[in-house]
Amino acid sequence: EEELQVIQPDKSISVAAGESATLHCTVTSLIPVGPIQWFRGAGPGRELIYNQKEGHFPRVTTVSDLTKRNNMDFSIRISNITPADAGTYYCVKFRKGSPDHVEFKSGAGTELSVRAKPSAPVVSGPAARATPQHTVSFTCESHGFSPRDITLKWFKNGNELSDFQTNVDPAGDSVSYSIHSTAKVVLTREDVHSQVICEVAHVTLQGDPLRGTANLSETIRVPPTLEVTQQPVRAENQVNVTCQVRKFYPQRLQLTWLENGNVSRTETASTLTENKDGTYNWMSWLLVNVSAHRDDVKLTCQVEHDGQPAVSKSHDLKVS
């Protein structure tokens, strides 16, 4: 006669986080008398998941009615699976006996892997703004996914980037994993409206990747170009001088007029005009009373943009 066998037909199962996992186990005999217990892991540190004889296991239900005469099905269902539930589960038959149960026979085990979706990718850029032609780094992070296999891609305005480095942690087995990627992006003057996108593809997402974005408008600083011009005489003793501040970003800008090095007027940019590329233009003018000057006047338009050192452009006004 054959001795009781514990049959776990599934070597492995995969379950999505939040769902229920059914772990199958049947025995071939009703003897010896004694309970079935389920454990996660093997050896002295194994974790009790279910005990037929006693205990309260709120997340575990038996698939069959264990009070039914001749029942040999000891499959269990574990509800609300999380990545922490991953592991190998053993169905173990015990033999009734004093003082402690004697382990009689174990099933071969069923490995439960948990499919957990990655969190929405978070893209962060540099702490300080940078100017065109500079290379800046963007990081992308996503957490809590399982299994470990994951694909991450970077895009700038729909064009895939190639200069990036990606790490998935931890390197060894874990209940869930995190991904961290750093991409290098060269800024151009046209990047105010640009977007950097981090795209994460995982088996749990069923072909619909998650995306995180960063707007380069948060990262770029486009310094202005200045042009100072003298307008035709408006009145006999007055000359109108304009300072054209072009193609700058962001808006924060302060302009100071100097007459022969002396501050004449300071103003903060307002009523800006926006260019198609997202940069701004602004114009300031200064009305100079020529009769107040005996000699030629050096007019300087000095601009402080976004807290950066001032840039300036001068114009010599001839007094005849």
Epitope: E1, L4, I31, V33, K53, L66, R69, K96
Partner: antibody, heavy 115, light 111 residues
């Protein structure tokens, strides 16, 4: 589905007897067979259970004098050193207790120990 | 070894009566529920009524019910029928697989 006992009868004190319990309608392979006896006018008394291989166990009072065995269709109870107080109707039943209760019983066979 | 005590040893009742039989274990039965009830009529083999303290065996009328846990158990016949006059035995199991002991029985007689 039934169990049919045989082998009972009159035996002298100190003698031996082997009882048989034949199953029809089901196999004994995955079930324990338990033996219970009832002395005339008395209550039921558990003797032991025959499982598979080493899985046989007996009430403390029955150890040594009672041994059981079984095939897929028949269970046996070997009784030795019989005494007058062993006189009883002997029943076999399918099951091994707890969640495997004694659900099918034989009709019983009378064993009389007397000189 | 576990000891099982049934009370009363006999009870007289009429058809239609509610009858309650008790069984007490000297220590907690295995799993707090290793307790079965059997019915035996004269000249017949016992018949399983209840197992695991409260599970009704297949084919047993629903007027029979079992309850209890640990050391104290009850068999209730909600409305006694003529065929229910018999002797009732409890069988309790201790922690050892061979520790299975019948109570002394309760005879239900016609009043």
């Amino acid at each position: 589905r039934q169990l049919v006992e045989s082998g009972g009868g009159l035996v002298q004190p100190g003698g031996s007897l082997r009882l048989s319990c034949a199953a029809s309608g089901f196999s004994l392979s995955s079930h324990g067979i338990s033996w219970v006896r009832q002395a005339p006018g008395k209550g039921l008394e558990y003797i032991g259970t025959i499982g598979t291989g080493v899985i046989t166990y007996y009430a403390s009072w029955a150890k040594g004098r009672f041994t059981g065995s079984k095939t897929s269709s028949t269970a046996y109870l070997q009784m030795t050193s019989l005494r007058a107080e062993d006189t009883a109707v002997y029943y076999c039943a399918r099951g091994s207790a707890w969640n495997d209760p004694f659900d099918y019983w034989g009709q019983g066979t009378l064993v009389t120990v007397s000189s | 070894d576990i000891e099982m005590t049934q009370s009363p040893s006999s009870v007289s009742a009429s058809v239609g009566d509610r009858v309650t039989l008790t069984c007490q274990a000297s220590q907690s039965v295995y799993g707090n529920n290793d307790l079965a009830w059997y019915q035996q009529k004269p000249g017949q083999a016992p018949k399983l009524l209840i197992y695991l303290a409260s599970t009704l065996a297949t084919g047993v009328p629903s007027r029979f019910s079992g309850s209890g846990s640990g050391t104290d158990f009850t068999l209730t016949i909600s409305s006694l029928q003529p065929e229910d006059f018999a002797t009732y035995y409890c069988l309790g199991g201790g922690d050892d697989e061979a520790d299975n002991v019948f109570g002394g029985g309760t005879k239900v007689e016609i009043k």
